[in-house]
């Protein structure tokens, strides 16, 4: 229904706390360099204005669209051009072009320092002094670093943060209470960020149809007892929610997500038997819980997929009459039978089926042509299964750090032109798949591994788009989203690459490395490893292991030495010489 004042409608629906949080996220995602105080001031002004519209929907400007209201606020910021350069040109445009322009200027890799967690005592002090401001800082810092973070989910993580601080700040040993819990939230939030970015990429590059196909597959796996009409309704609603969030319409997105959660909980009987626990929770927890609810038990009496999609005499007729609906039912039926497949794989199978019908239905004897289509799925299914087996075996043998290093070598050989920080970040993220997925039961590994890898590779593609340097990466990133992972997996050593000159300073280290946290030490060593591969792309695994072991031994020795500086300055050059010899 149409509302006289959109802003009043959203304020009433969401309540002041969520309204303010979402406006803060929106501003932080659009203008990523502004300070918290600048954004907090704007949020307060918008909230005060929303309250006047709630009191009188006919008041001046209350009938304006949210894009107009928010855009006008952003464009009124002083020194916009000095701080944001050409983004300021967006302000010369009218809506909806102005919002599109803001979206295009979102930076997936803003040059902001890493979000450092304050010391436990300091954190608890500022949390106790002003919990609202503390949580505002959290929303601002995360949102500006992750401009496509799913806004209602970020409110959920802020709520988690709040609960952890409330609990741990009352304990004697705040540090040991906070660290593991906050690390857990951070890890989950980072995964949520790359997953959502993938959804927005799907929407931006391939449109709503592509996202809806993803949603149909995912929902059919989770809710195999829901009928096709129910799955289609959920997929349509979920597509709308994601389109809004990806498009910066965060108030509408959060409101519609709450509506969708309400609908699911009111219609559990026709959706799934597993929803009750989620539906008993308050809003943010409920929506989060529903988004990752366990798969319902598959119906026992599902007929073979071939009956309707291969053996039926009317396959081509049904396909001709309504292509999207027929392919949608195929995707639904295949997905509900295969919770053990990744969504990417299911979409590849649906694409193969569509291509087969396109070809076969134009022949004189279609059934003879498409009769073998299910057998032709076999190699498509085997490829990711082998990938999972090979990589999980390697992870179990090497552990997370060693597995990351193996991936780093592999990817540096595939795309040596890519910057070392990007390669290290990608390899570290890709390597986490082991810890995340390889410990799961067999039937959950494939969906976990492949869908996670796809999301990480999407980030690689986004970073590479900014400064394209590798033809290999461009080739894999230009295709469809579901083909990316197999494309990257199939890449081999880039034969066109001219090896980097050996620079001693790249491998020169100082005593300050000794005091770095373990994670930072690992990154330093992985940076050196990537540089070694760039110098010798065809170095054997044995050669690289020799060098890295020597390097680890060198660090260990010098960091234990009484005079660390002298050790680094005398032993360092010897290490460099040994490295050169080992790789000669």
């Amino acid at each position: 229904e149409a509302h006289k004042s959109e802003i009043a409608h959203r304020y009433n629906d969401l309540g002041e706390q969520h309204f303010k949080g979402l406006v803060l996220i929106a501003f932080s995602q659009y203008l990523q360099k502004c300070s918290y105080d600048e954004h907090a001031k704007l949020v307060q002004e918008v909230t005060d204005f929303a309250k006047t519209c709630v009191a009188d929907e006919s008041a001046a400007n209350c009938d304006k669209s949210l894009h107009t209201l928010f855009g006008d606020k952003l464009c009124a910021i002083p020194n916009l051009r000095e701080n944001y350069g050409e983004l300021a040109d967006c302000c010369t445009k009218q809506e909806p072009e102005r919002n599109e322009c803001f979206l295009q200027h979102k930076d997936d890799n803003p040059s902001l320092p890493p979000f450092e967690r304050p010391e436990a005592e300091a954190m608890c002090t500022s949390f106790k002094e002003n919990p609202t401001t503390f949580m505002g800082h959290y929303l601002h810092e995360v949102a500006r670093r992750h401009p496509y973070f799913y806004a209602p989910e970020l409110l959920y993580y802020a709520e988690q943060y709040n609960e952890i601080l409330t609990q741990c700040c009352a304990e004697a040993d705040k540090e040991s209470c906070l660290t593991p819990k906050l690390d857990g939230v951070k890890e989950k939030a980072l995964v949520s960020s790359v997953r959502q970015r993938m959804k927005c990429s799907s929407m931006q590059k391939f449109g709503e149809r592509a996202f809806k196909a993803w949603a149909v597959a995912r929902l059919s796996q989770t809710f195999p007892n829901a009928d096709f009409a129910e799955i289609t309704k959920l997929a349509t609603d979920l597509t709308k929610v994601n389109k809004e969030c990806c498009h910066g319409d965060l108030l509408e997105c959060a409101d519609d997500r709450a509506e969708l959660a309400k609908y699911m909980c009111e219609n559990q009987a026709t959706i799934s038997s597993k929803l009750q626990t989620c539906c008993d929770k308050p809003l943010l927890k409920k929506a989060h819980c529903l988004s990752e609810v366990e798969h319902d038990t598959m119906p026992a009496d599902l007929p073979a997929i071939a009956a309707d999609f291969v053996e039926d005499q009317e396959v081509c007729k049904n396909y001709a009459e309504a292509k999207d609906v027929f392919l949608g039912t195929f995707l639904y039926e295949y997905s509900r039978r295969h919770p053990d497949y990744s969504v990417s794989l299911l979409l590849r199978l649906a694409k193969k089926y569509e291509a087969t019908l396109e070809k076969c239905c134009a022949e004189a004897n279609p059934p003879a042509c498409y009769g073998t289509v299910l057998a032709e799925f076999q190699p498509l299914v085997e490829e990711p299964k082998n990938l999972v087996k090979t990589n999980c075996d390697l992870y179990e043998k090497l552990g997370e750090y060693g597995f990351q290093n193996a991936i780093l070598v592999r990817y540096t050989q595939k795309a040596p032109q890519v910057s070392t920080p990007t390669l290290v970040e990608a390899a570290r993220n890709l390597g986490r798949v082991g810890t995340k997925c390889c410990t799961l039961p067999e039937d959950q590994r494939l969906p976990c591994v492949e869908d996670y890898l796809s999301a990480i590779l999407n980030r690689v593609c986004l970073l590479h788009e900014k400064t394209p340097v590798s033809e290999h990466v461009t080739k894999c990133c230009s295709g469809s989203l579901v083909e990316r992972r197999p494309c990257f997996s199939a890449l081999t050593v880039d034969e066109t690459y001219v090896p980097k000159e050996f620079k001693a300073e790249t491998f020169t280290f100082h005593s300050d490395i000794c005091t770095l946290p373990e994670k930072e030490k690992q990154i330093k060593k992985q940076t050196a490893l990537a540089e070694l591969v760039k110098h010798k792309p065809k170095a054997t695994a044995e050669q690289l292991k020799t060098v890295m072991d020597d390097f680890a031994q060198f660090l260990d020795t010098c960091c234990k030495a009484a005079d660390k500086d002298t050790c680094f300055s005398t032993e360092g050059p010897n290490l460099v010489t040994r490295c050169k010899d080992a790789l000669a």
């Epitope: 005499q313 009317e314 396959v315 081509c316 007729k317 001709a320 239905c361 022949e363």
Partner: nanobody, 115 residues
Framework: EVQLVESGGGLVQPGNSLRLSCAAS????????MSWVRQAPGKGLEWVSS????????LYADSVKGRFTISRDNAKTTLYLQMNSLRPEDTAVYYC????????SSGGTLVTVSS
């Protein structure tokens, strides 16, 4: 919405000819193979002939081979069946269908071969 409308049937003496037409709409005609199927009184559906989307490949049931010719005009989105040397056993309702289907969702056209 997919529509298939057959025409050209009628009463004909054995040994004579008829040309059936099927006007198609509501789908990408050239992307689909098309078939003719028939149903004699009191019998089940019988496949008669098929043609590929481009018109380059054709298939015929043994019972009509050498007598019937299937063709199509993609520009006019129309399917044809030229029936020569008709026999009494060709008496049936003829339906055009999409793909190699034996379905009969259209109205059909009656062909009666009798002296």
């Amino acid at each position: 919405e997919v529509q298939l409308v057959e025409s050209g049937g009628g009463l004909v003496q054995p040994g004579n000819s008829l040309r059936l037409s099927c006007a198609a709409s509501g789908f990408t005609f050239s992307s689909f193979g098309m078939s003719w199927v028939r149903q004699a009184p009191g019998k089940g559906l019988e496949w008669v002939s098929s043609i590929s989307g481009s018109g380059s490949d054709t298939l015929y049931a043994d019972s009509v081979k050498g007598r019937f010719t299937i063709s199509r005009d993609n520009a006019k989105t129309t399917l044809y069946l030229q029936m020569n040397s008709l026999r009494p056993e060709d008496t049936a309702v003829y339906y055009c269908t999409i793909g190699g289907s034996k379905s009969r969702s259209s109205g059909g056209t009656l062909v009666t071969v009798s002296s």
